[in-house]
């Protein structure tokens, strides 16, 4: 009895850019090939249970078949590799989810304020929707000291209130990093003395 998978798909957890091309490879295990009397010619690729046309397949060798998608437009694709076995039955080999999205844009319009007696809060424009989990981190430093990063919360991704106490009469440099599975970008740096950003109660 074949309990473990008959093969695998590479890459296993792909995150791809929307409207880009993507190739997946299904590799059959030899014991599975022997058991079912098949090779890579017998692989059937499916997305969300629909069979992909054979024109999109490439037989790499006796054990491996690839499928190529052009201009991916869906955010979430269930891709399965199956083999045609006895009596034209299909046996699932392996499945993956292709997640699509966009890399983050460079954050813009970074500005900070210090509410009197409170800690500094900065906000920015995070840019377009990426359809992916995108983390924004506010970075700040003096010429001689790096402050703790301020990680924006998921529900307020375009602002962050720092943990450290504000120090006045010394210039601070502040910028934002945006990162997701498709890339990492940094905003322009701003340089200011927090005393000029104080907002009276």
């Amino acid at each position: 009895e074949l309990l473990d998978p008959c093969g695998y798909i590479s890459p296993e957890s792909p995150v791809v850019q929307l409207h880009s091309n993507f190739t997946a490879v299904c590799v059959l295990k030899e014991k599975c090939m022997d058991y079912f009397h098949v090779n890579a010619n017998y692989i059937v690729w499916k997305t969300n249970h629909f069979t992909i046309p054979k024109e999109q397949y490439t037989i790499i060798n006796r054990t491996a078949s690839s499928v190529t998608f052009t201009d991916i437009a869906s955010l979430n694709i269930q891709l399965t590799c199956n083999i045609l076995t006895f009596g034209q039955l299909e046996q699932n080999v392996y499945g993956i989810t292709i997640i699509s999205g966009l890399p983050p844009e460079k954050p813009k319009n970074l500005s900070c304020i210090v509410n009197e007696g409170k800690k500094m809060r900065c906000e920015w424009d995070g840019g377009r929707e990426t359809h992916l989990e995108t983390n924004f981190t506010l970075k700040s430093e003096w010429a001689t000291h790096k402050f703790a990063d301020c990680k924006a919360k998921r529900d307020t991704p375009t602002s962050c209130t720092v943990d450290y106490s504000t120090v006045y009469f010394v210039n601070i440099e502040v910028w934002v990093e945006a990162e997701n599975a498709l890339g990492k970008v940094t905003s322009d740096h701003i340089n200011f003395d927090p005393v000029y950003k104080v907002k009276p109660n």
Epitope: E30, M33, D34, F36, H37, V38, N39, A40, N41, Y42, I59, N61, R62, L84, F86, Q88
Partner: antibody, heavy 119, light 108 residues
């Protein structure tokens, strides 16, 4: 015990076609592939193409593309190899063989069919 | 396509000799290498498949080894009926499968 029995020798004129048959007996070829290999006089073995009955697909060596057609009649377990636009260099013994899908070895062979192309 | 190169192209040996034929692939083919014996006027006969597995009914004096690009067919003690032409064949690519050019084994 699988046996592959091929049709008899053929003498053909240049430009004509030849169709060689290969009948399987003593076993099913449902899960196997039928491969055609040829051997010119005094030469080595040359792969021509393969048919995969369960998929209804045939694959051909590039040099034969457009001239070679491999078909299968599953009701009679007979494979056919048709080569068109024959030339003198197609004179050879043509073999069919059962290919094991998983490993790609040819474990049963037909006896061979000599095709002579001569004007 | 994957090219297969056999060496030597011919060799002379005596009954009882140990004989080795080599086959080299132009790229790695894992263990997808098969060996055939062909006698004049006859169809080839499978001897070894998957580089080292002996086909049913083939005498144990035949053995195969190797993986990747370099493979060997060995006949441990040559018998009169072993004088024939031997071919290696790769089945890693599918299609096409490809054969070596053959090694003719003659009586010394």
């Amino acid at each position: 015990q699988v046996q592959l029995v091929q049709s008899g020798p053929e003498v053909k004129k240049p430009g004509s076609s030849v169709k060689v048959s290969c009948k399987a007996s003593g076993g099913t070829i449902d899960r196997n592939e039928i491969t055609w290999v040829r051997q010119a006089p005094g030469q080595g073995l040359e792969w021509m193409g393969v048919i995969i009955p369960i998929l209804g697909e045939a694959h051909y060596e590039r040099k034969f593309q457009g001239r070679l057609t491999i078909t299968m009649d599953e009701s009679t377990s007979t494979a056919y190899m048709e080569l068109s636009n024959l030339r003198s260099e197609d004179t050879a013994v043509y073999y069919c063989a059962r290919e094991r899908a998983a490993r790609g070895y040819l474990d049963y062979w037909g006896q061979g069919t000599l095709v002579t192309v001569s004007s | 396509d994957i090219q297969m190169t056999q060496s030597p192209s011919s060799l002379s040996a005596s009954v009882g000799d140990r004989v080795t034929i080599t086959c080299r692939a132009s790229q790695s083919i894992s263990s997808y290498l098969n060996w055939y014996q062909q006698k004049p006027g006859k169809a080839p006969k499978l001897l070894i498949y998957a580089a080292s597995s002996l086909q049913s009914g083939v005498p144990s004096r035949f053995s195969g080894s190797g993986s990747g690009t370099d493979f060997t067919l060995t006949i441990s003690s040559l018998q009169p009926e072993d004088f024939a032409t031997y071919y290696c064949q790769q089945s890693y690519s599918t299609p096409p499968i490809t054969f070596g050019q053959g090694t003719r084994l003659e009586i010394k």
